[in-house]
């Protein structure tokens, strides 16, 4: 069967001030299982900006009803946007591990910038 | 505090149809999806059915699909279990659970009693 | 199938290792079902191969590795006498199976 892949379809996303920017990204496979993550930027110092598995991410809505068995998608939208959003957001796919999750693979990310409220 | 409750077991004859209901509060229902799992008398747990936190998709074990139909009343908190052709087979406490995000179990209902007999 | 040993025994205070084969590590999610009595409600000891829930003490714990998952209870003790039962979901069919459940006694 084919490796799992994270797709990110667009490599940039620009977005009004006050609006909410949606974040798109699909899986080619549910194999491994393991929770999917997004996060702003990369390396030791990126953010958390969701996880599937736990935590409240409250200007955060998946697009997806994540709990269908079956679903691939894992785009997600985030309200309320301001200058300080700005930055490359990655979905990044984990593997199941013990005692924590591994990471399996990454999407080549999305760079949100964020556009001056209309006046 | 999460609570399951199962209700709408009975006596039924072969043949006939019956609806089982769980009835949760404590959690944000709408948010969750749940499973029906049952065990027979002195057997193991089964799992039945599940149905997605919205409600648009099932899933089946095949030995219910076309017998068996899971459905939610999200504003009612309410799940049920829609039983149809039943057999001796079908003899069994019948639980309510709520799935991880991963589909497993976290939360089961105290069960409702289901027999089959003529 | 899982499958899993009909039963164990320990005397108190001592481990407990109830194990669980038959799942495919890359696709199977385990978990750990508590049943002490037929017909009464089970509780869930072990999620998501070893995750415990809050209220379950920290005695109960859960590995997995290549086909197989382990529940371990360390220090048993008298109450934990029940019906042990390790469940998987398959991320490939979407279904979710039960082994046929283990009976611990503690002497």
């Known amino acids: 069967e084919d490796e799992l892949q994270v797709i990110q379809p667009e490599k940039s996303v620009s977005v009004a001030a006050g609006e909410s920017a949606t974040l798109r990204c699909a899986m080619t496979s549910l194999i491994p299982v393991g929770p999917i993550m997004w996060f702003r930027g990369a390396g030791a110092g990126r953010e958390l900006i969701y996880n599937q598995k736990e935590g409240h991410f409250p200007r955060v809505t998946t697009v997806s009803e994540l709990t269908k068995r079956n679903n691939l998608d894992f785009s997600i939208s985030i309200s309320n946007i301001t200058p300080a959003d700005a930055g490359t957001y990655y979905c990044v796919k984990f593997r199941k591990g013990s005692p924590d999750d591994v990471e399996f693979k990454s999407g080549a990310g999305t760079e949100l910038s964020v556009r001056a409220k209309p006046s | 505090d999460v609570q399951l409750v199962e209700s709408g077991g009975g006596v039924v004859r072969p043949g006939e149809s019956l609806r089982l209901s769980c009835a949760a509060s404590g959690f944000t229902f709408s948010s969750y999806a749940m499973s029906w799992v049952r065990q027979a008398p002195g057997k193991g747990l089964e799992w039945l059915a599940g149905?997605?936190?919205?409600?648009?998709?099932?899933y089946y074990i095949d030995s219910v699909k076309g017998r068996f139909t899971i459905s939610r009343d999200n504003p009612k908190n309410s799940l049920y279990l829609q039983m149809s052709s039943l057999t001796a087979e079908d003899t069994a406490v019948y639980y309510c659970?709520?799935?991880?995000?991963?589909?497993?179990?976290?939360?089961w209902g105290l069960g409702t009693l289901v027999t089959v007999s003529s | 199938a899982l499958t899993q040993p009909a039963s164990v025994s320990a005397n108190p205070g001592e481990t407990v290792k109830i194990t669980c084969s038959g799942g495919d590590y890359y696709s199977t999610y385990y978990a750990w079902y508590q049943q002490k009595s037929p017909g009464s409600a089970p509780v869930t000891v072990i999620h998501s191969d070893d995750k415990r829930p809050s209220d379950i003490p920290s005695r109960f714990s859960g590995s997995a590795s290549g086909s197989a998952a382990t529940l371990i209870i360390t220090g048993v003790r008298v109450e934990d006498e029940a019906v042990y039962y390790c469940g998987g979901y398959d991320g490939r069919t979407y279904i979710n199976t039960f082994g046929a459940g283990t009976t611990l006694t503690v002497l």
């Open positions: 149905i997605s936190a919205g409600g648009s998709d099932t």
């Open positions: 659970a709520r799935e991880t995000w991963n589909h497993l179990f976290d939360y």
